[in-house]
Amino acid sequence: SWMWNQFFLLEEYTGSDYQYVGKLHSDQDRGDGSLKYILSGDGAGDLFIINENTGDIQATKRLDREEKPVYILRAQAINRRTGRPVEPESEFIIKIHDINDNEPIFTKEVYTATVPEMSDVGTFVVQVTATDADDPTYGNSAKVVYSILQGQPYFSVESETGIIKTALLNMDRENREQYQVVIQAKDMGGQMGGLSGTTTVNITLTDVNDNPPRFPQSTYQFKTPESSPPGTPIGRIKASDADVGENAEIEYSITDGEGLDMFDVITDQETQEGIITVKKLLDFEKKKVYTLKVEASNPYVEPRFLYLGPFKDSATVRIVVEDVDEPPVFSKLAYILQIREDAQINTTIGSVTAQDPDAARNPVKYSVDRHTDMDRIFNIDSGNGSIFTSKLLDRETLLWHNITVIATEINNPKQSSRVPLYIKVLDVNDNAPEFAEFYETFVCEKAKADQLIQTLHAVDKDDPYSGHQFSFSLAPEAASGSNFTIQDNKDNTAGILTRKNGYNRHEMSTYLLPVVISDNDYPVQSSTGTVTVRVCACDHHGNMQSCHAEALIHPTGLSTGA
């Protein structure tokens, strides 16, 4: 059987000779050189050589435990003559013993960490870790202790864990933001002779909201023309906050002052400025100066710093309204006038009034915008604004006239205003009623008396207030001895009735009936219209079969004896 134990070898051997490891030996070895010892496995023939006769093993090179702590090899004892193994091939171990030849190495050359400013003492910042390649199971070669070389009194390090903590109260970022801390890791439990390594930890204090906004001045003054429309920016104010980011965000608001309703403040998110804007229309003539109280505040406040005071500040903003030469202002936004259509030329319809709103109260002159009254139907008194006709009107031609009047400052013609005038033409009964259409009818030869042969309708261009009321009658010259009668239906229609039994188309083929149509407005208007009646042969149902040929061709042909 094999005769050996585990082999141990000290690392980093510096002797001039090969380092002796141990002896492989079989109890079958008679010491006569008949056996050959063979080594195979990790580093055999290179790192480890064997005297094939004696079984002595030597290490040919300096070994580093941290590179390889254990070598597993195989041993054979073979009869030189036959090649026959005298023992089974066996595995053995060469264990490399540690020496303290490695300093602790930090996992990072430089650490970066952050911690909020004003943190309590003992607040965790970061944990640094150093590893020592030496054997942790043997001695203290790999027992690492941490200490701080640079960075006191601001920070401390826990010797065993490498945890860095704050060590000073009220560290203020606004005073100092960056700290460079140097940490040492030393092996041998920190004892003398231990090896050490260092790392740098760059610590940045992160911002907390421990500073309120502050206006750099207590009063601001801005000017704005009275003509500024709502939304117009007047000026910018800016409070400064020593904090950064979200903690330096500022909201502006108007908290007091007579301009509370007249102005707004909006916050410019990019510049953190407050922009004063016009909220309502200004009027220099009414109020020339406004005072506002504007407040700047942090929207995000940390309750633990409220003891430092309110996180807001106020400033007074004085706004001076500047006078602007304004155009004249009409008394109404629009004027509606009316006039009878029978008005004579130069009839006054009404008047408009405009005033210069400026303190100077410059006089105004009036004119009609001729683009809106191309036919020059109307005119205006340039001094007092009276509107009058310059041409005759006709409601039936145009009911409404829409014109524009211009008011211009006499001293400054550039300042002018315009106002619409809507003129309604009122109806006068100046049109007679007339037939709604041309009437041409027929009567059957065998017609009976009082038979309705045509219904008449009338139209009138006028538009009386109480509606049309037409009356119909035969013209006086045809009323006596007429073959037909007119029956007024009292509903603005009339019927033509036969007055006798039977008509002879050979005796009289066509009758012309003059009908008078009157309205009952003032002054009464009437007209005479003629209805043509033809005598025709009809079937027993009363359907026309034939009429006088000439009458059909010349329906307006004259005949007598209606």
Epitope: N79, R80, G83
Partner: antibody, heavy 117, light 111 residues
């Protein structure tokens, strides 16, 4: 370079003896066993015996035990094989071969021994 | 004595084809995982040359088309792709016990 150089061919009478030499070079002579193998014409290989040059320990096959003697001269790194009481069936080529762990890794060129009356 | 029996006695194989030679020992020649069986090539008029030792280990300088396998009593020499220069007689040999013995040889020729 390992070399094994054998003595020249021999013609012997039946009943006589023959001594074949094998000079080794290119390695440490005492570190390896030296073997002798013969091959009769048209036949296979036949192991005869061997010697440990460092201790002159020998092993012979039973067939040749009484007739064969293997010796060495360490000073000249030469091995010898003497076969006595030769018979016609001993006509063969005789090889020396270096032994290493049971295998023959280097061979001499062979010596032809002819036994004839 | 351990008797070594080779088969076949002769073998004709085409160039590039595989050649397989078997050797059977009359008893086991293996111990502790070591197989004390070796193979030789002998070309005409030359001494034998070691090809394979301990059943499967290729001797330095021998082409890798030669390979050996086997254990206990049955062993094989394989030429994966026969070349013209491989024409020879091949012998197996055991060193497990005295006397050391050879197989009768297998003659390999080109078909």
């Amino acid at each position: 370079e390992v070399q094994l150089v054998q003595s020249g061919a021999e013609v012997k009478k039946p009943g006589s003896s023959v001594k074949v030499s094998c000079k080794a070079s290119g390695y440490t002579f005492t570190n390896y066993w030296m073997h002798w193998v013969r091959q009769a014409p048209g036949q296979g290989l036949e192991w005869m015996g061997d010697i440990d040059p460092s201790h002159s320990e020998t092993h012979y096959t039973q067939k040749f035990k009484d007739r064969v003697t293997i010796t060495v001269d360490k000073s000249t790194s030469t091995a010898y094989m003497e076969l006595s009481s030769l018979r016609s069936e001993d006509t063969a080529v005789y090889y020396c071969a270096r032994g290493d762990l049971g295998r023959f890794d280097y061979w001499g060129q062979g010596t032809t021994v002819t036994v004839s009356s | 004595d351990i008797v070594m029996t080779q088969s076949p006695d002769s073998l004709a194989v085409s160039l590039g084809e595989r050649a397989t030679i078997n050797c059977r020992a009359s008893e086991s020649v293996s111990i502790h995982g070591t197989h004390l069986m070796h193979w030789y090539q002998q070309k005409s008029g030359q001494p034998p040359k070691l090809l394979i030792y301990a059943a499967s280990n290729l001797e330095s300088g021998v082409p890798d088309r030669f390979s050996g396998s086997g254990s206990e009593t049955d062993f094989t020499l394989t030429i994966s792709s026969l070349q013209a220069e491989d024409v020879a007689v091949y012998y197996c040999q055991q060193s497990f016990e005295d006397p050391w013995t050879f197989g009768g040889g297998t003659k390999v020729e080109i078909k």
